[in-house]
Interface confidence: medium
Amino acid sequence: RAPRCRELPAQKWWHTGALYRIGDLQAFQGHGAGNLAGLKGRLDYLSSLKVKGLVLGPIHKNQKDDVAQTDLLQIDPNFGSKEDFDSLLQSAKKKSIRVILDLTPNYRGENSWFSTQVDTVATKVKDALEFWLQAGVDGFQVRDIENLKDASSFLAEWQNITKGFSEDRLLIAGTNSSDLQQILSLLESNKDLLLTSSYLSDSGSTGEHTKSLVTQYLNATGNRWCSWSLSQARLLTSFLPAQLLRLYQLMLFTLPGTPVFSYGDEIGLDAAALPGQPMEAPVMLWDESSFPDIPGAVSANMTVKGQSEDPGSLLSLFRRLSDQRSKERSLLHGDFHAFSAGPGLFSYIRHWDQNERFLVVLNFGDVGLSAGLQASDLPASASLPAKADLLLSTQPGREEGSPLELERLKLEPHEGLLLRFPYAA
């Protein structure tokens, strides 16, 4: 008799793929545009990325550091009207893209939560949750919660409101903290909360340290669903050298949890390469005309247009990974087992029941390495075969689909491999 199939876990929409943050509408759209109507025109692009949710804003009225002139129920007229927002919501729903609204109150000010009047601000957030839930948003994000006094209890209350409305709604909290104990204390009282932090930004870009951080986090959080990013808002290029972007994309898409990206991460958008652009929100490079300030500063391979036409680009890799992440059971909700593969390497298996299994091997080092995969680290349920098929490499030149002998696996500097192999009883 065939073994009985393992029961599928409950899958919420944010479990099925990546979230895409657009914190600055104007920078995302560029050319002096930057409103909700314009964003609606970019939804097809988001669909092409196969992302499941758009984390938008903040877009509410906020006069810097002025509680009285901050209205979480009103859209700043610079971004558009409530009708524009409703229209965006309807269009996003038709394309199966969920909309999460950032309600961080004082986003233009010094302290995101104002330094005084915590209760007044918290009441404003409560009212806003109810208002926007009724308007049809799929969830909320609040950032910089380290600046919010009694954050845990407020988050618990807001989570209660959000989930009480419908269990299909999501609350995301963001913190600048990278301290695991602080992160765990926030998660402790809010089991369903999705928390973005700077935890992984401390990885030092080495395989051993990254492996240690990931496994510590997963062990500490147990079987709860988590998210993966390098910060609550910033671009990957703020933390990583260009040669590691592909590696991190592969890792973020294949770890167990929801990957969260900022606009531009898919093309390696880098503020440092665009003189005069703000580090936290550089202009999105749709094509070479997106940054007219310095002629010749932007080459085609830095832009969406240029990378869309190149199957070997970072954008093409992002699209492929996003597609795999959203349709393979082992990547959607599979078990995770990290194991030793040699210095500078981070490797792990994702597997679910009798479905196709995935092996990820990441070389963080700047030298080529032979991978010594220590299958003895793995439980019997996740044993390694002698060969696995190469699904993709982060570097060009490998023959995809070809079987690779795992005992003789060699990786190029900064190369990541995604291999697949069948379940064997």
């Epitope: 409950a10 109810e130 989930k163 419908s166």
Partner: antibody, heavy 119, light 106 residues
């Protein structure tokens, strides 16, 4: 302990308005979501709508604008009004409070009040 | 709205017998919730988040399923289990219920 108690007339004439009160003890209606649900003679349950902690409301579209839910926070009571009733509205009406949060589910129900619509 | 279809509508089981009640959703839901109602009483929360038993529910009850297909199982029927069981979704408004399964003791 949270308790909900429905009250109101048990007989309403067709085309008139059905009005019910839900009195809440052990919890404040300024927290959470407070629902009305009805059960028809054939045992079918129908969700009618809620009034939330902030006073905002949601109504089931199937009730085609005939329903209104209001509250009086000073009395810790909330109310149901159903206009233009027909015999099809004969049912047991329940007020209910649900809490879904993390790994918690509480559903507090009143004992229900049978309302018959008849001439 | 999400339509929940329960089956069977009515069934009877002898003491000790295994009972399974099914609930099918018209579109995918994250979790299913189950209520028990006995004549003259209000519905009681019985199983939540698909498989977690509410306080005081005997361990012979279990829940399972995912997507659009869910079920409630009683491993060994007892007299006190005779009741009507409803499935319910909290995925989206309006909240909806199955038509109920009336379980009788044979």
């Amino acid at each position: 302990e949270v308790q909900l108690q429905e009250s109101g007339p048990s007989l309403v004439k067709p085309s008139q308005t059905l009005s019910l009160t839900c009195s809440v003890t052990g919890d404040s209606i300024t927290s959470g979501y407070w629902n009305w649900i009805r059960k028809f003679p054939g045992n079918k349950l129908e969700y009618m709508g809620y009034i939330s902690y902030s006073g905002s409301t949601y109504y089931n579209p199937s009730l085609k604008g005939r329903v209104s839910i209001t509250r009086d926070t000073s009395k810790n009571q909330y109310y149901l009004q159903l206009n233009s009733v027909t015999t099809e509205d004969t049912a047991t009406y329940y007020c209910q409070r649900h809490v879904i949060y993390d790994y918690t589910w509480f559903a507090y129900w009143g004992q229900g009040t049978l309302v018959t619509v008849s001439a | 709205q999400i339509v929940l279809t329960q089956s069977p509508a009515i069934m009877s089981a002898s003491p000790g017998e295994k009972v399974t009640i099914s609930c099918s959703a018209s579109s995918s839901v994250g979790y299913m919730y189950w209520l028990q109602q006995k004549p003259g009483s209000s519905p009681k929360p019985w199983i939540y988040r698909t498989s977690i038993l509410a306080s005081g529910v005997p361990a012979r009850f279990s829940g399972s399923g995912s997507g659009t297909s869910y079920s409630l199982t009683i491993s060994s029927m007892e007299a006190e289990d005779a009741a009507t069981y409803y499935c319910q979704q909290y995925q989206s408004y309006p909240l909806t219920f199955g038509a109920g399964t009336k379980l009788e003791l044979k």
